[in-house]
């Protein structure tokens, strides 16, 4: 026999159900709430310190570089690469043609000076891009030198120095007591490298990793 | 954690949330249909009181497991 | 569309979903009580054979909407 | 030691050119370093004219236009100094120099330099 | 072109006296400058490069010092042989420029 208050038991059963399911819905939508809030917040709290990043990271430049010029790399308009803007750029590197005339240590040390080294040349094709920007009446410094007049030839950047990867004019290098290298044009050979004296001024090439903002 | 890899992992689990909660719903709804059927047989005609005006008010068997 | 904004406008199509899901599965829920609750007390007691052991294969009751 | 003499005649007319050799003995010039002129007005202000490297490679200084020629005779050690269309504001000392010691840091070698006047 | 300004162009002092010029350059020079005595009608003899080493054979009562733009050339207790002009140069960038010079006297 069913006792005579069932029916409000009942009732005040299907009340209590109808909260908890109904509490389970608002938690489950809070926590939807919340994983679409943080979706939506944090990458814009994620924009704005990668912003914060990025203009911190132009301020380190800027003392050197006023203007960066950028392209975007890829799809994702996250990604941008920049050269300082009278730079030119060439894969993963910028590069700049100094003209003013300064011995090989100077030369190295106003590379610096903007972020860069003396130019590391690794491939015919980077030789290639960068002679197109220099003068035939013109040498310039490269970030290889032989500091012990031995032969043991090194890049500015620790580059191992590859014998196969070279470009020196024939006959060259020819002179234990020059050890600094340069690019130049010889008319016979069109464009190659020469060993001379370091203290002897000449133009130079600078180059940096492109700055990824 | 970055931006994208965030926005990645927030899809995941919506995502999961999503089936998870599309399966209880079917799985419920099919019960649901069992039980009538069920139920039908058995009463010789007890849902006539529920008529196709009152399907949009139909409530949960008692079911102690809560929704997952 | 860059891969980040497709990854946020599918956050929200799953977030959406899952609201709608969510209240869809609660309703049901409810609707599933009550007609429990409604058909016992006219059929008296004519859900004795749906146990508590056949509680989990419980079915939708007679609806023609399709699941959203 | 190195040393370093300058000689060319000491009076010049205006138009005309101005003619010096600077003759080297002690080092070869041919072996390393740059040969500079550089020149001093009455007013005791110095300036750089350009110079000729080891190599035979040049460099004059802009504010010297296209007047200024510097050349050499590797064979008696020898560099030279022209400079055409010469006016009165080109009087001054000239000195010959060895640049690229204490690794470019300083000129250390200067001939005793020879006044040259230009005058009518 | 870097340009140098030498200060002062006429200094009079002592013997004994100590004494300092300077010479600031248009741009930063990395301490490449030099510095160099000359009396009359004497070719100039280099004091100082680098900004602060002394050439050879020169005196320790010389010293030279500075960074960047603003350099200085120091005299310790003056010596009769230490009149006459100086002059400081850059040697950064071609061309290296001059100071304009300064007379020091006998007061």
């Known amino acids: 026999m069913v006792p005579e208050e069932e029916p409000q038991d009942r009732e005040k059963g299907l009340w209590w159900f109808q909260l908890k399911v109904w509490s389970m819905a608002v938690v489950s939508i809070l926590l939807l709430s919340v994983c679409f809030t943080v979706s939506s917040v944090v990458p814009h709290n994620f924009m704005y310190s990668k912003t914060v990043k990025r203009l911190s990271k132009l301020r380190e430049y800027q003392q050197y570089h006023p203007s960066l010029t950028c392209v975007m790399e890829g799809k994702d308009i996250e990604d941008w690469s920049c050269c300082p803007t009278p730079w030119t750029s060439f894969q993963s590197s910028c590069y700049f043609i100094s003209t003013g005339m300064q011995s090989w240590t100077k030369s190295q040390k106003n590379c610096s000076v903007m972020g860069a080294d003396l130019v590391v040349i690794n491939t015919r094709e980077e030789q290639d891009f960068i002679i197109q920007n220099l003068k035939r009446n013109s040498s310039y410094f490269l970030g290889l030198s032989d500091p012990g007049g031995r032969r043991h030839w090194q890049w500015v950047d620790q580059t191992p120095y590859n014998e196969n990867v070279t470009f020196w004019h024939s006959g060259e290098p020819n002179n234990l007591d020059e050890r600094c290298a340069i690019i130049n044009f010889r008319s016979s050979e069109e464009w190659g490298w020469n060993d001379i004296h370091c203290h002897v001024p000449q133009k130079s090439i600078c180059k940096m990793k492109k700055i990824y903002i | 954690l970055g931006e994208p890899q965030l926005c990645y992992i927030l899809d995941a689990i919506l995502f999961l949330y999503g089936i998870v909660l599309t399966l209880l719903y079917c799985r419920l709804k099919i019960q649901v249909r069992k039980a009538a059927i069920t139920s039908y047989e058995k009463s010789d005609g007890v849902y006539t009181g529920l008529s196709t005006r009152n399907q949009e008010t139909y409530e949960t068997l008692k079911h102690e497991k809560p929704p997952q | 569309l860059g891969e980040p904004q497709l990854c946020y406008i599918l956050d929200a199509i799953l977030f959406l979903y899952g609201i709608v899901l969510t209240l869809l599965y609660c309703r049901l829920k409810i609707q599933v009580r009550k007609a429990a609750i409604t058909s016992y007390e006219k059929s008296d007691g004519v859900y004795t054979g749906l146990s508590t052991r056949n509680q989990e294969t419980y079915e939708t009751l007679k609806h023609e909407k399709p699941p959203q | 030691d190195v040393q370093l003499q300058e000689s060319g005649p000491g009076l010049v007319k205006p138009s005309q050119s101005l003619s010096l050799t600077c003759s080297v003995t002690g080092y070869s010039i041919t072996s390393a370093y740059y040969w500079n002129w550089i020149r001093q007005f009455p007013g005791n202000k110095l300036e750089c004219m350009g110079y000729?490297?080891?190599?035979?490679?040049?460099y004059y200084n802009p504010s010297l236009k296209n007047r200024i020629s510097i050349t050499r005779d590797t064979s008696k050690n020898q560099f030279f100094l022209s400079l055409n269309s010469v006016t009165t504001e080109d009087t001054a000392t000239y000195f010959c120099v060895r640049g690229g010691d204490y690794d470019d840091g300083g000129f250390a070698y200067w001939g005793q330099g020879t006044l040259v006047t230009v005058s009518a | 072109d870097i340009q140098m300004t030498q200060s002062p162009a006429s200094l009079s002092a002592s013997v004994g006296e100590t004494v300092t010029i300077t010479c600031r350059a248009s741009g930063n020079i990395h301490n490449y400058l030099a510095w160099y005595q000359q009396k009359q009608g004497k070719s100039p003899q280099l004091l100082v490069y680098n900004a602060k080493t002394l050439a050879d054979g020169v005196p320790s009562r010389f010293s030279g010092s500075g960074s960047e733009t603003q350099y200085s050339l120091k005299i310790n207790s003056l010596q009769p042989e230490d009149f006459g002009n100086y002059f400081c140069?850059?040697?950064?960038?071609?061309?290296?420029?001059f100071g304009g010079g300064t007379k020091l006297e006998i007061k």
């Open positions: 140069q850059h040697f950064w960038i071609i061309p290296y420029t």
């Open positions: 000729i490297s080891y190599d035979g490679s040049n």
